[in-house]
């Protein structure tokens, strides 16, 4: 009599998560009498997947009726496959007894599960950086299988090359994770820029997943300052303006100092936005020239986004003509606490 063989024709089967898998198994003889059981894995830690005689296996059904006379097909159908179902499945023939005795095992079928990667999540630096500095962005995606995956970085549609990618774990696993860190050199024009992390995987059928981050969250463009004065219609008044240009983000505190003493403080409010996403703002003082002697220095001090203050000074220019317009009564003492009129726009 020919020795019984357990045949598992497929060495491997690959299915997409959520679908069903069929694992084929046939035996070459009806003798000896005894059941077939399916296991995942081998050795003492193997896991019983299907046993016709007993047990509750809600996701497993036999392809043919195993109770039918002369049945030699013991293939099974597993529904709603998840990555956790991956592994090597063995169809095992037992000889009937008390207990049943294991007689022969099939060669095993490796079930691999294709699972889509999660939507990539891009995170940027925790602190802002200024133009010409390099910042790092991290992209993460999880839960995919098989391990092969392609990740690309783009900045405003241009592919980046300075990045490092790791896929974990290194060995065989039910599912994998990818983490990539890209280095981006900031420019003054990057307020409107965007970085994109693009993930391509066999399960996505050529339609990659994308995660984005705005460089506006990562950049700080420091302002440039200019202080100048203009005469006003009233001959004893001049307008001293502090022009704050090309800064980002909006958070700005401006302080006027008169000969080093704080005169007034303002928070930037009505800003003008430039095409590149940066902002401009101006603050002005209405100065009574009669209330000042020569040698008054006005300083515009700007604290931007919590950074150390930058300042620009201007020596008040009072013409001889303006001095002539001032009567002795309006000139006041040199150290008189004459707070200048202020305004902004």
């Amino acid at each position: 009599e020919e020795e019984l063989q357990v045949i598992q024709p497929e060495k491997s089967v690959s299915v997409t998560a959520g679908e069903s898998a069929t694992l084929n198994c046939t035996v070459t003889s009806l003798i000896p009498v005894g059941p077939i059981q399916w296991f995942r894995g081998a050795g003492p830690g193997r896991e019983l997947i299907y046993n016709l005689k007993e047990g509750h296996f809600p996701r497993v059904t036999t392809v043919l009726d195993p109770t039918k006379r002369n049945n030699m097909d013991f293939s099974i159908h597993i529904s709603n496959i998840t990555p956790a179902d991956a592994g090597t499945y063995y169809c095992v023939k037992f000889r009937k007894g008390s207990p049943d005795v294991e007689l022969k095992s099939g060669a095993g079928t490796e079930l691999s599960v294709r699972a889509k990667p999660s939507a990539p999540v891009v995170s940027g630096p925790t602190a802002r950086a200024t133009p010409e500095h390099t910042v790092s962005f991290t992209c993460e995606s999880h839960g995919f299988s098989p391990r092969d995956i392609t990740l690309k970085w783009f900045k405003n549609g241009n592919e980046l090359s300075d990045f490092q990618t790791n896929v974990d774990p290194a060995g065989k696993s039910v599912s994998y994770s990818i983490r990539s860190t890209a280095r981006v050199v900031l420019t003054r024009r990057d307020v409107h820029s965007q970085v994109i992390c693009e993930v391509a995987h066999v399960t996505l059928q050529g339609d990659p997943l994308r995660g984005t981050a705005n460089l506006s969250e990562a950049i700080r463009v420091p302002p440039t300052l200019e202080v100048f004065q203009r005469p006003m219609r009233a001959e004893n008044q001049v307008n001293v303006t502090c022009q704050v240009r090309k800064f980002y983000p909006q958070r700005l505190l401006l302080t006027w100092l008169e000969n080093g003493n704080v005169s007034q403080t303002e928070t930037a409010s009505t800003l003008t936005e430039n095409k590149d996403g940066t902002y401009n703002w101006r603050s002005w003082l209405l100065v009574n020239t009669c209330a000042h002697r020569d040698g008054v220095v006005l300083t515009c001090q700007v604290e931007h986004d919590g950074q150390p203050a930058v300042s620009k000074s201007h020596a008040l220019e009072v013409s001889a003509h303006q001095k002539e317009q001032c009567s002795d009564t309006t000139s006041g003492p040199v150290l008189a606490p004459t707070a200048p009129l202020g305004g902004s726009g």
């Epitope: 894995g41 050795g43 005795v101 294991e102 007689l103 095992s105 060669a107 060995g171 065989k172 696993s173």
Partner: antibody, heavy 122, light 112 residues
């Protein structure tokens, strides 16, 4: 080429807990059993226990109450914790890979770490 | 637990000559599937053990063909057809049929 590397303290005080980690490089945790075996000075090999890739553990009955083997597939590592150690636990501790192809038994411990010497002393 | 017993415990050998080590198990290692769960290991001085033979008679990868395993049930033999100087060390048999995995006491092979 799969390689195993044990790491952990070489000296443990009596009654304290021995903790060792084995890092698997160049291969997969899946489909194998991951074993700890020890060898007291001048003596033979003693199996402590192993863990299957699916998380199922098996221990030497005389050590079962003191031993825990765990697996971290994300780091490709497995670990041994042994509580209430005594001088009798002084040994070279090996981590090893055990193969299983089919059936109920196993097919040889085919990859071994270089071993780490653990001395239990106050 | 399955008890493994080796003999001899010490084996002086001459390079180029054959050698053999016996191993006996307290119960049969021949499983109902026809597979024998018996392995042989060599631990060279100062090194980790290495697998020589698994399944009673299958040579592990990279093991020279001068090593062969035989036997069935409870009695097993490891043969070295021509001993070489690098074969010195302690040879262990081990069973892998059931937990706990158990090993023999070891046979120390040294050059005469």
């Amino acid at each position: 080429q799969v390689q195993l590397q044990e790491s952990g303290p070489g000296l443990v005080k009596p009654s304290e807990t021995l903790s060792l980690t084995c890092t698997v490089s160049g291969g997969s945790i899946r489909d194998y059993y991951w074993s700890w075996i020890r060898q007291p000075p001048g003596k033979g090999l003693e199996w402590i226990g192993f863990i299957y890739y699916n998380g199922r553990t098996f221990y030497q009955s005389s050590l079962k109450s003191r031993v825990t083997i765990s697996l971290d597939t994300s780091k490709n590592q497995f670990s041994l914790k042994m509580t209430s150690v005594t001088a009798a636990d002084t040994a070279v501790y090996y981590c090893a890979r055990v193969r299983a192809y089919s059936g109920i038994g196993l097919d040889g411990t085919d990859v071994w770490g270089q071993g780490t010497t653990v001395t239990v002393s106050s | 637990d399955i008890v493994m017993t080796q003999s001899p415990l010490s084996l002086p050998v001459t390079p180029g000559e054959p050698a053999s080590i016996s191993c006996r198990s307290s119960q049969s290692l021949l499983y109902s599937t026809g597979y024998t769960y018996l392995d042989w290991y060599l631990q060279r001085p100062g090194q980790s053990p290495q697998l020589l033979i698994y399944g009673g008679s299958s040579r592990a990868s990279g093991v020279p063909d001068r090593f062969s395993g035989s036997g069935s049930g409870t009695d097993f033999t490891l043969k070295i057809s021509r001993v070489e100087a690098e074969d010195v060390g302690v040879f262990y048999c081990g069973q892998a049929l059931q937990t706990p995995l158990t090993f023999g006491q070891g046979t120390k092979v040294e050059i005469k």
